[in-house]
């Protein structure tokens, strides 16, 4: 599957390219920040090794058109090269990265930006793509992506952290936007709906897919999260679109096989490792790119966002098992965890392709 | 100070049994897939058979598949391997290698033991 | 037969600079799987020399190096010393036989 491209030759001409906002230098969200009523709010996972101390318990979720999530912001981890293996390694360290950003939920208080400032910013994500108002820029090659495919042992986590389910992923896995614009993977995790309904981040000309993956990166310009948080460049995450399709995607069922074993908020698993590769889209040339944020507290702008053209196949019975296996903070689904779109504000999406 | 150390090696007749042990110490044993990896007399290195660090998922190699057992006790910091239905061609040094938590390399290694299967 | 190709031998004079290759195929080192590297002194635990293609752990000297390129791995070994004569492995994963292997080894033989 492939997203619709309405017109053949029409970029938006000018705007700004979403030059980094310090943090707390935002605007506040105009009427058009808030999002619609159809829109639920959801979450951009920071990679992290385990829960903050004393976040256990979260009040119910109670849905409200608000774009607030009912989450923890999970540690921010140290990432350093692949050093000696005989120590164990993973991308995460305990290391909180402030009280005021560890509650903040769905569809209630506090209002995200008094959680964070930076989600009040002018460059926040996801985003509404149009592709007929996308910027053609032939400069963006294919992406490359090196390390991705992984043995069985070591196992790597699988944790539903109440927002969403992540995989931890090991060192190595490497990806180039282009020359000199390196990063390291560090986890990815997924959006959905639930039952009948979409659940996807970003959108396509209002279009909401019924999910979302985003394999979430750091630039090898820096060692750790933290340091890269709001940098221009510093996060790079890939997004691809999650659809119905006839068949069982096998790669996805090694994970979506697994989720009945993390139901519970908090509860994680081990699991093979896999072809990371295998669960992205198999068109690496094609796809919109743009600079927005974090969706979630913190939502640190500076993030490069690349969305994928093609879309990934799931059979509906593993898109019933993704959005209708978890639970969330007290006692409700884990469901609907995607934020309402952002004004573009003058920001161009470019694509990889006329 | 980070070993591995075996135990279990012998001769044996073919179609018998042997268990081999490897004692770990100085790492988190129970953190990391563990593997068995052996080497025939004048041969290359031959991987056995592997275990997760939860011990809850196992791996073989087709030659060895439903007559060797791997298993691991986390409490004891001890990893085994059962060698039922033994062949002559089973006959090699036996190495317990840690499998790393780096992509599948093998970074902490026994000092071996011998397996002989001779009638 | 080893499912990853290394040549028998290798040799070279002190502070020659010698390569010992491993070849596979599209389901091991061709799949993306990563290469790494064994010295081995019979009679002894074998050494993890290279790990990740490319990186050495704490302790190797900067004397080794790998990469890895399509299907096919190589190590090398620069100002060749005399220790450095011995066995040399390299390993990958197979998802086709769902197993970790090795190539046959190099004896490196210092002249």
């Known amino acids: 599957q492939r997203l619709p491209r309405m017109q053949e030759d029409s970029p938006l001409g000018g705007g700004s390219s979403g030059e980094d906002d310090p943090l707390g230098e935002e605007d506040l969200p105009s009427e058009e920040d808030s999002p619609r009523e159809e829109d639920p709010p959801g979450e951009e996972d920071l990679p992290g090794e385990e829960d903050l101390p004393g976040e256990e318990d979260l009040p119910e979720v109670k849905p409200k058109s608000e774009e607030e999530g009912s989450l923890k912001l999970e540690d921010l981890p140290t990432v350093e090269a692949p050093g000696d293996p005989q120590e164990p390694q993973n991308n995460a360290h305990r290391d909180k990265e402030g009280d005021d950003q560890s509650h903040w939920r769905y569809g209630g208080d506090p209002p995200w930006p008094r959680v964070s400032p930076a989600c009040a910013g002018r460059f926040q994500s996801p985003v509404d793509i149009r592709p007929q108002l996308a910027a053609f820029c032939p400069a963006l090659r294919p992406l490359e992506l090196l390390g991705f495919q992984l043995p069985p042992l070591p196992e790597l986590r699988l944790r539903n952290n109440g927002h969403s389910v992540q995989l931890t992923l090991p060192p190595g896995l490497e990806m180039a936007l282009g020359p000199g614009r390196e990063y390291r993977a560090l986890q990815l995790h997924l959006h959905w709906g639930a039952a009948g309904r979409p659940g996807s981040e970003h959108t396509v000309e209002g279009h909401r897919f019924p999910a979302e993956i985003h394999v979430v990166h750091l630039s090898t310009a820096f060692a750790r999260v933290d340091e890269a948080l709001g940098r221009p460049g510093g996060l790079a995450v890939l997004a691809a679109f999650l659809e119905e399709g006839p068949e069982e995607n096998s790669a996805y069922e090694q994970l979506l096989s697994r989720l009945e074993e993390i139901a519970e908020e908090g509860s994680e698993t081990q699991v093979p490792g896999l072809d990371i590769s295998a669960l992205l889209p198999s068109d690496f040339s094609r796809y919109f790119q743009y600079e927005g944020s974090l969706t979630t507290p913190p939502c640190a702008q500076g993030v490069i966002w690349t969305v994928f053209n093609q879309t990934v196949m799931l059979s509906a019975k593993q898109l019933h098992t993704l959005s209708d296996t978890l639970w969330g903070p007290g006692d409700s689904r884990l469901q609907l965890n995607f934020r309402a779109t952002q004004p573009l504000n003058g920001r161009v999406i470019e694509a990889s392709f006329p | 100070q980070v070993q591995l150390v075996q135990s279990g090696g012998g001769v044996v007749q073919p179609g018998g049994s042997l268990r081999l042990s490897c004692a770990a110490s100085g790492f988190p044993f129970s953190s990391y897939a563990m593997s068995w990896v052996r080497q025939a007399p004048g041969k290359g290195l031959e991987w056995v058979s592997a275990?997760?660090?939860?011990?809850?998922?196992?791996y073989y190699a087709d030659s060895v598949k439903g007559r060797f057992t791997i298993s691991r006790d986390n409490s004891k910091n001890t990893l085994y391997l059962q060698m039922n239905s033994l062949r002559a061609e089973d006959t090699a040094v036996y190495y317990c290698a840690n499998n790393g938590n780096y992509r599948g390399a093998f970074d902490i290694w026994g000092q071996g033991t011998m397996v002989t299967v001779s009638s | 037969q080893s499912v990853l190709t290394q040549p028998p031998s290798v040799s070279g004079a002190p502070g020659q600079r010698v390569t010992i290759s491993c070849t596979g195929s599209s389901s091991n080192i061709g799949a993306g799987y990563d290469v790494h590297w064994y010295q081995h002194l019979p009679g002894t635990a074998p050494k993890l020399l290279i790990y990740g293609n490319s990186n050495r752990p704490s302790g190797v000297p900067d004397r080794f190096s790998g990469s890895k390129s399509g299907t096919s791995a190589s190590l090398a070994i620069t100002g060749l010393q005399a220790e450095d004569e011995t066995d040399y492995f390299c390993?990958?994963?197979?998802?086709?036989?769902?197993?970790?292997?090795f190539g046959g080894g190099t004896k490196v033989t210092v002249l």
């Open positions: 275990i997760s660090a939860n011990g809850g998922t196992t």
């Open positions: 390993q990958s994963y197979d998802s086709s036989l769902s197993a970790w292997v």
